[in-house]
């Protein structure tokens, strides 16, 4: 907390500029008008203020906007955003994607901080759903973002947003999350033809039921082992040896290298040895 002191003669700031870096903390408090700061926030980032000086500027904004900053100020916070607490951010109403991008840019290259998580939460809740443009933005900054959401939160993702999802965005998703995302992907990609559809749906197949895998097995999709290993164990177990052979096509030989890992291990134990022998891979049930 900075003490209230009168501004020395001739030091009253008429604009936010580089001369302010030479002001002591108490001088900034006394000589910079909060309303001026709010209207010229975009200049703050170009000035090499110390962290202590930024604390003073934040304090001035907090006094001016006790109920939370307006979006016109939030959009230009720049590095001052790093000074905000989750409690501060919970007071904000951020509706512009440009504002979100500007603040994410400040935190770029770092792990998702509690501040960023709160900001995203406020933004998504304000929009009511995770639309395509938002998802595009969030996954560009944080590829693991989608998989950080709970199945309940994922249920608010409209199928149209699935077009923004890249395979790497799903790398850390668990089966419960893919169970929610898979039907959305099916809906999103349903009008695509054959090979294009399979390329798009492949990353989501960890949420596919047995019936879908059976259908795909008859259509020359040649699923790779990496995809097969991510399938739900309960969806793979009912597949016959012939169905798995058709599903994997030329990649079926890869089963040998994965025979000790799920879901291959559990699937092997379910099969008759005679059927496994038809693969000629030496798999032991």
């Amino acid at each position: 907390e900075v003490e209230k002191t009168a501004c020395p003669s001739g030091k009253k700031a008429r604009e936010i500029d580089e001369s302010l870096i030479f002001y002591k903390k108490w001088e900034l408090e006394a000589c910079v008008d909060a309303a001026l700061l709010a209207t010229q926030m975009d200049r703050v980032n170009a000035i090499p203020f110390t962290y202590e000086q930024l604390d003073v500027l934040k304090h001035k904004l907090d006094e001016l906007y006790p109920q939370g900053y307006p979006e016109s100020v939030i959009q230009h916070l720049g590095y001052l955003f790093l000074k905000m607490s989750p409690e501060d951010i919970r007071k904000w109403n951020v509706t512009s994607l440009e504002t979100l991008k500007a603040l994410l840019e400040v935190n770029k290259g770092h792990e998702m901080s509690p501040q960023v998580a709160t900001l995203i939460d406020r933004f998504v809740k304000g929009r009511g759903q995770l639309d395509k443009d938002t998802l595009d933005t969030l996954t560009a900054f944080y590829p693991g973002y989608l998989c950080s959401l709970s199945p309940e939160e994922l249920s608010s993702v409209p199928p149209s947003s699935i077009w923004a999802v890249r395979p790497q965005d799903l790398d850390t998703c668990d089966p419960r999350q893919l169970d929610v995302l898979y039907p959305k992907a099916r809906l999103a990609f349903q009008n695509m033809n054959g090979s294009e559809y399979f390329v798009k749906i492949q990353s989501f197949l960890g949420g596919a039921p047995t019936e879908d895998l059976k259908a795909l097995s008859q259509q020359n999709v040649s699923m790779d082992l990496a995809t097969f290993m991510k399938l739900r164990t309960d969806a793979v177990l009912p597949l016959t040896v012939a169905e798995v052979q058709k599903l994997l096509g030329p990649h079926v030989e890869g089963l040998k290298a994965e025979e000790r890992h799920r879901p291959v291990r559990d699937w092997i134990l379910r099969q008759r040895q005679d059927d496994l022998d038809t693969l000629g891979l030496g798999l032991q049930g």
Epitope: P183, N191, Y197, K214, A215
Partner: nanobody, 128 residues
Framework: QVQLAESGGGSVQAGGSLRLSCAAS????????MGWFRQAPGKEREGVGS????????NYSESVRGRFTISLDNAKKTLNLQMNSLKPEDTAMYYC?????????????????????WGQGTQVTVSS
């Protein structure tokens, strides 16, 4: 998951008509197929006809072409089979079935082994 329930079966005189319906619950996607199959006593189950949901592409077996018509009411999630000029040899248990994903519409042909979801069936009896 898709659940299928047939209705509309019954007894009819040769030359008469019947309309079978199949109510689907669960998600229906454009790249799904739905089909009608039948099984007469002591015979193998055989295809009657099928429809590719996206675009309504239909496919009929030789024995019913020109007499039977398949249609889909997407809003009601109902598959219909309009059967005209019925013959005694059309007597069978009629089943509705679905393929969850068809990467090409040609895959929708009414081939029993391709269909993974099945209804319980409805009996059709045609007497001479």
């Amino acid at each position: 998951q898709v659940q299928l329930a047939e209705s509309g079966g019954g007894s009819v005189q040769a030359g008469g008509s019947l309309r079978l319906s199949c109510a689907a619950s669960g998600n229906l996607y454009n790249n799904m197929c739905m089909g009608w199959f039948r099984q007469a006593p002591g015979k193998e189950r055989e295809g009657v006809g099928s429809i590719y949901i996206g675009g309504g592409y239909t496919n009929y077996s030789e024995s019913v072409r020109g007499r039977f018509t398949i249609s889909l009411d997407n809003a009601k999630k109902t598959l219909n089979l309009q059967m005209n000029s019925l013959k005694p040899e059309d007597t069978a248990m009629y089943y509705c079935a679905a393929i969850p994903i068809a990467l090409t519409r040609a895959f929708c042909a009414p081939i029993v082994s391709r269909y993974t979801y099945w209804g319980q069936g409805t009996q059709v009896t045609v007497s001479s």
